[in-house]
């Protein structure tokens, strides 16, 4: 891998509706399941076609789900928070943490900020050197004058 | 992503026994939640087994209870189905299949709409 791989990390509340299959999606993690190394959080791993979370648009794969209707799911096993979403009602608040891959490396999923998948360098860099020639232009016809 | 391969299986006589595996290769297995399914010429692929994560749940259709065992070994990224017993009717291609984590939703193991990934299968014939 070339580089260094950073994240911008971005926290949503995101408010989903129970649907007749479920809120639509899969979970991993906890303290008996690290998927993450040294981080026992809880993941989503999988989003179904044409469920809650599907239809919302929101929730996306990688994103780590923080607390499921205010309830903290720090420290769970994972059955404990698969049973926590199952048990949390017809309306369900999800506190969730996207992240946003912003250097070179594997892609990362695409947040709402990134629909390109550009990492932001590349912008940066050619909007510097515009600016730059643009002030250099300025300079040598304010001399002229 | 996840390659799945089956092997073991073959030509044998009723009331004899085989035994199949299922190697992961791309990702380590031990998110994932894994099946086995069959599909008899003319018919539907139709749900054999499942084992949860951790190994310490199984499920399994009526047809195999008592004659087939699901079970897995996460260090060998690798998922067993031991068949007893065989049939005639246990005649098939069986495929092994995956999902990653586990579903916040009613747990529907023998739902092949579940899974993500499929092997590519391994005959089966009881004569």
């Known amino acids: 891998m070339n580089g260094r791989v950073d994240y911008l990390v971005t926290e949503e509340e995101i408010n989903l509706t129970r649907g007749p299959s479920g809120l639509g999606f899969n979970i991993v993690g906890g303290t008996d399941q690290q998927y993450v190394s040294n981080d026992s959080g809880i993941y989503v791993s999988r989003i179904k076609e044409n469920g809650a979370a599907a239809l919302d648009g929101r929730l996306q794969e990688g994103d780590k789900i923080l607390s499921v209707n205010g309830q903290d799911l720090k420290n769970l096993l994972h059955q404990d928070a698969v049973d926590l979403f199952r048990n949390a009602g017809y309306a369900v608040s999800l506190r969730v943490q996207h992240r946003l891959q912003v250097q070179n490396g594997p892609i990362g999923h695409r947040g709402e900020g990134d629909p390109s998948g550009i990492p932001i360098f590349m912008v940066l860099v050619p909007v510097f050197a515009l600016t730059m020639v643009a002030a250099w232009a300025f300079m040598r016809y304010r001399q002229q004058l | 992503h996840v390659q799945l391969v089956e092997s073991g299986g073959g030509l044998v006589k009723p009331g004899e026994s085989l035994k199949l595996s299922c190697v992961a290769s791309?990702?380590?297995?031990?998110?994932?939640?894994m099946g086995w399914f069959r599909q008899a010429p003319g018919k539907e692929r139709e749900f054999v087994a499942a084992v949860s994560w951790s190994g310490n749940q199984q499920d399994y259709a009526d047809s195999v209870k008592g004659r087939f065992t699901i079970s897995r070994d996460n260090a060998k990224n690798t998922v067993y189905l031991q068949m007893n017993s065989l049939k005639p009717e246990d005649t098939a291609v069986y495929y092994c299949?995956?999902?990653?984590?586990?579903?916040?939703?009613?747990?529907?193991?023998?739902?092949?709409?579940?899974?993500?990934?499929w092997g590519q299968g391994t005959q089966v014939t009881v004569s």
């Open positions: 299949a995956a999902v990653i984590g586990s579903t916040v939703d009613s747990y529907s193991p023998s739902d092949p709409l579940e899974y993500d990934y």
């Open positions: 791309g990702e380590t297995l031990s998110s994932y939640i």
